[in-house]
C-alpha cells in the first residue's frame, strides 16, 4: 500500500523555540515515522532537518538548528515505513515574521500599599529578539483576588510599580510583551499572585522636591514623624527600560545617607546631565519604611530653574520690576529654553503681610504702594509645562524705599 504524505503542517515559533506539528494522513497504518528536510532561499539542495528525522509522534522541535531568523526557509515532510510517501512541501516562511513573543518572566515584591513588578524576557539572550531586546514594552492585567475586577496597564517597562493598593490583600496579575516596531504582541505569562503586607507603621516620605541653590541641589520631602533618619537613592531613568543592564542598581547619594532632617544638600556635580529617578526611605532605628514614590529629576531643567534676577525702579506709589535671566557661576546668564511664569512676593518691611503677583511678562508693575516706605520683594520662577511642574527657589529679598509722594496734588 502506498503511504500518503502527511498534511496540515503547522510551524509554531515562540521566542527561540521552533516546533512543527502535523496530521497523519492515514491513521490505520502503524509504525510510521516522519522526516523533514529544509531548504534556504537561493539554494537548490534540500538538507535533513536535525531534530526532525524518523519521528514517531506528530510533533518535533528544531530549535537546535542555527538559522538566520530573517531569511526565508522552506520545509518538506514525508512518511516512512518500508517505503516512503511523496514529499509534502510546506509554504515557505521567514522565522522572524512567524515568531511569537513568549511569556515573560515576572518577579513581584510586595509592599503594604504597592507592588513592584520586575519583568524580563522569557528567553535569556534570545536569538530571535537579539536586535529588539531593548524595544520590548509590556502590558499587564491586574485584579484583586477577591473581586476579579480587572485593570489593564499598557506600555510599561521592565520595572513597574503599582501604587494605591490595600494592605493585606492578594492581587493577581499576568504580563505580556510587545514589540511595537514589529507589530508583535506576545503570550501572557502565567498568573502571579502576591499578598500586600501589613500596613507599615512608618509611611514612606512624600512630596519630594528638588531645587537649586548656589552650586547645590536641595532635596526636600515631607514626613509625618520627628526623630527619623532618611536615605536617598538615585537611578538613571533610562535603566527602567532595561534592568538586565548591569548598571541597573539604585545608588546612594553620599550626602543624603542617614540624614536626620527632611532635606539634604548635595553638589550639582554629583549628577552629570541626564534624567534620574530619586526615592527616599525613612527609618526610626528599629523599623524602616517602604520606599517613597519615585520622582523624575531632569538636571537640565533643574539647572536652568535658578531663581530669577531682577532690578527695581522705585516710584512713589509703585515698583517697576524688570526680570532677567539668572546668573550661573562666572556671571553668565542661563539660557531659558522653557516658558516660565514668575511669582513675585512683596511686603512692607515693617510687616509680615505678604502680597503676591503672578506674571508671564518679564516687566511687572507692583501697584498701590505707600510713598517713602520700604518694601521688600522676592521672586521665583515656575515652568508652565504641567508635566514638569518645577519651581525655582525664591531669590534673595531685595528691599527698596518708594519715592516721596507727589506734593503738588
Amino acid at each position: 500500500k502506498n503511504l500518503k504524505s502527511p498534511q496540515k503542517v503547522e510551524v509554531d515559533i515562540i521566542d527561540d523555540n521552533f516546533i512543527l506539528r502535523w496530521n497523519r494522513s492515514d491513521e490505520s497504518v502503524g509504525n510510521v515515522t516522519f522526516s523533514f528536510d529544509y531548504q534556504k532561499t537561493g539554494m537548490d539542495n534540500w538538507i535533513k532537518l536535525s531534530g526532525c528525522q524518523n519521528i514517531t509522534s506528530t510533533k518535533c522541535n528544531f530549535s537546535s538548528l542555527k538559522l538566520n531568523v530573517y531569511e526565508e526557509i522552506k520545509l518538506r515532510i514525508r512518511a516512512e515505513k518500508e517505503n516512503t510517501s511523496s514529499w509534502y512541501e510546506v509554504d515557505s516562511f521567514t522565522p522572524f515574521r512567524k515568531a511569537q513573543i513568549g511569556p515573560p518572566e515576572v518577579h513581584l515584591e510586595a509592599e503594604d500599599k504597592a507592588i513592584v513588578i520586575h519583568i524580563s524576557p522569557g528567553t535569556k539572550d534570545s536569538v530571535m529578539w537579539a536586535l529588539d531586546g531593548l524595544s520590548f514594552t509590556y502590558s499587564l492585567v491586574i485584579w484583586k483576588n477577591s473581586s476579579g475586577v480587572e485593570e489593564r496597564i499598557e506600555n510599561i517597562y521592565s520595572r513597574h510599580k503599582i501604587y494605591k493598593l490595600s494592605p493585606e490583600t492578594t492581587y493577581c496579575l499576568k504580563v505580556k510583551a510587545a514589540l511595537l516596531t514589529s507589530w508583535k504582541i506576545g503570550v501572557y505569562s502565567p498568573v502571579h499572585c502576591i499578598k500586600t503586607t501589613v500596613e507599615n507603621e512608618l509611611p514612606p516620605p512624600e512630596n519630594i522636591e528638588v531645587s537649586v541653590q548656589n552650586q547645590n541641589y536641595v532635596l526636600k520631602w515631607d514626613y509625618t514623624y520627628a526623630n527619623m533618619t532618611f536615605q536617598v537613592q538615585w537611578l538613571h531613568a533610562f535603566l527602567k527600560r532595561n534592568p538586565g543592564n548591569h548598571l541597573y542598581k539604585w545608588k546612594q547619594i553620599p550626602d543624603c545617607e542617614n540624614v536626620k532632617t527632611t532635606q539634604c544638600v548635595f553638589p550639582q556635580n554629583v549628577f552629570q546631565k541626564g534624567i534620574y529617578l530619586l526615592r527616599v526611605q525613612a527609618s526610626d532605628g528599629n523599623n524602616t519604611s517602604f520606599w517613597s514614590e519615585e520622582i523624575k529629576f531632569d538636571t537640565e531643567i533643574q539647572a536652568f530653574l535658578l531663581p530669577p534676577v531682577f532690578n527695581i525702579r522705585s516710584l512713589s506709589d509703585s515698583f517697576h520690576i524688570y526680570i532677567g535671566a539668572p546668573k550661573q557661576s562666572g556671571n553668565t546668564p542661563v539660557i531659558q529654553d522653557y516658558p516660565l511664569i514668575y511669582e513675585i512676593i512683596f511686603w512692607e518691611n515693617t510687616s509680615n503681610a505678604e502680597r503676591k503677583i503672578i506674571e508671564k511678562k518679564t516687566d511687572v508693575t507692583v501697584p498701590n504702594l505707600k510713598p517713602l516706605t520700604v518694601y521688600c520683594v522676592k521672586a521665583r520662577a515656575h515652568t508652565m509645562d504641567e508635566k514638569l511642574n518645577k519651581s525655582s527657589v525664591f531669590s534673595d529679598a531685595v528691599c527698596e524705599k518708594t519715592k516721596p509722594g507727589n506734593t503738588s496734588k
Partner: antibody, heavy 123, light 107 residues
Framework: QVQLVQSGAEVKKPGASVKVSCKAS????????MNWVRQAPGQGLEWMGK????????HFNQKFRDRVTLTVDKSTSTVYMELSSLRSEDTAVYYC????????????????WGQGTLVTVSS | DIQMTQSPSSLSASVGDRVTITCKSS??????LAWYQQKPGNAPKLLIS???TLESGVPSRFSGSGSGKDYTLTISSLQPEDFATYYC?????????FGQGTKLEIK
Amino acid sequence: QVQLVQSGAEVKKPGASVKVSCKASGYTFTSYWMNWVRQAPGQGLEWMGKIDPSDSETHFNQKFRDRVTLTVDKSTSTVYMELSSLRSEDTAVYYCARGGRISFDYDAALDYWGQGTLVTVSS
Amino acid sequence: DIQMTQSPSSLSASVGDRVTITCKSSEVIYNRLAWYQQKPGNAPKLLISGATTLESGVPSRFSGSGSGKDYTLTISSLQPEDFATYYCQQYWNKPFTFGQGTKLEIK
C-alpha cells in the same frame, strides 16, 4: 544550572587569616548579590555579609565588620571571603549563598548555596 | 538586630503526620521571611520565600503562612526524606537573622 563551588577545608592557628573562595556558574554573575553565612558545629546559621559582584559594594553584619573582607574576581566569577584575627570560636562551616537580583528594590532569600568550607581554628 | 524565635526547638513525629513550625520576629518583617531545610553534612536548601511562595521543585506538602511578626511552616503529610533541621530567616533588615532551628526527628 546554578552552581556555587567553594574551596576546600582549612586548618588555621589563632590570630591567622583564612580566605575562602566561591566560584559561581550557570547564571549572570554580576546580576545577583553574593552572601556569606557561617555555621559553628552543632549551631545555627549566622549571616556575615554580602557583596555586589558588579561594583564590589558590601554590607556587613556589624559583628564581623572589622575582621571580614569580601572581594570579587569578575574574570573567573569568583567571590572571596577573608576572615582575619581568627579565634577558636570562628571554627565553623562557611557558606556562600546567592541572594536577590541587584535590580530588586528589596533584599531576597538565599536561593542557591555552596557546599560549605570547614575552617578549623586550633593551636 | 531583629531576633527570630523558632518553636519548637525539636519535634518528634511519624511519617504521614501534619507538622507545624512557628517563627516569631521581634519587629514586623513585612513577609520578608524564608524557610530552609538542612540535612546533616549538607548546605541549607531554600523551601519558601516571601513567607508563602514555594520554590520550584519543592513538594507541595510544604506551605508557608503568616504576616507581620508571626509566620508558620506546615508539612501536611511527613515523608521519610523530610526529617531534617528547619530554619526561618528574615531578610527585611540587615543584618539578616535566622531562627535557632527546629530539629524534626522520627518518633
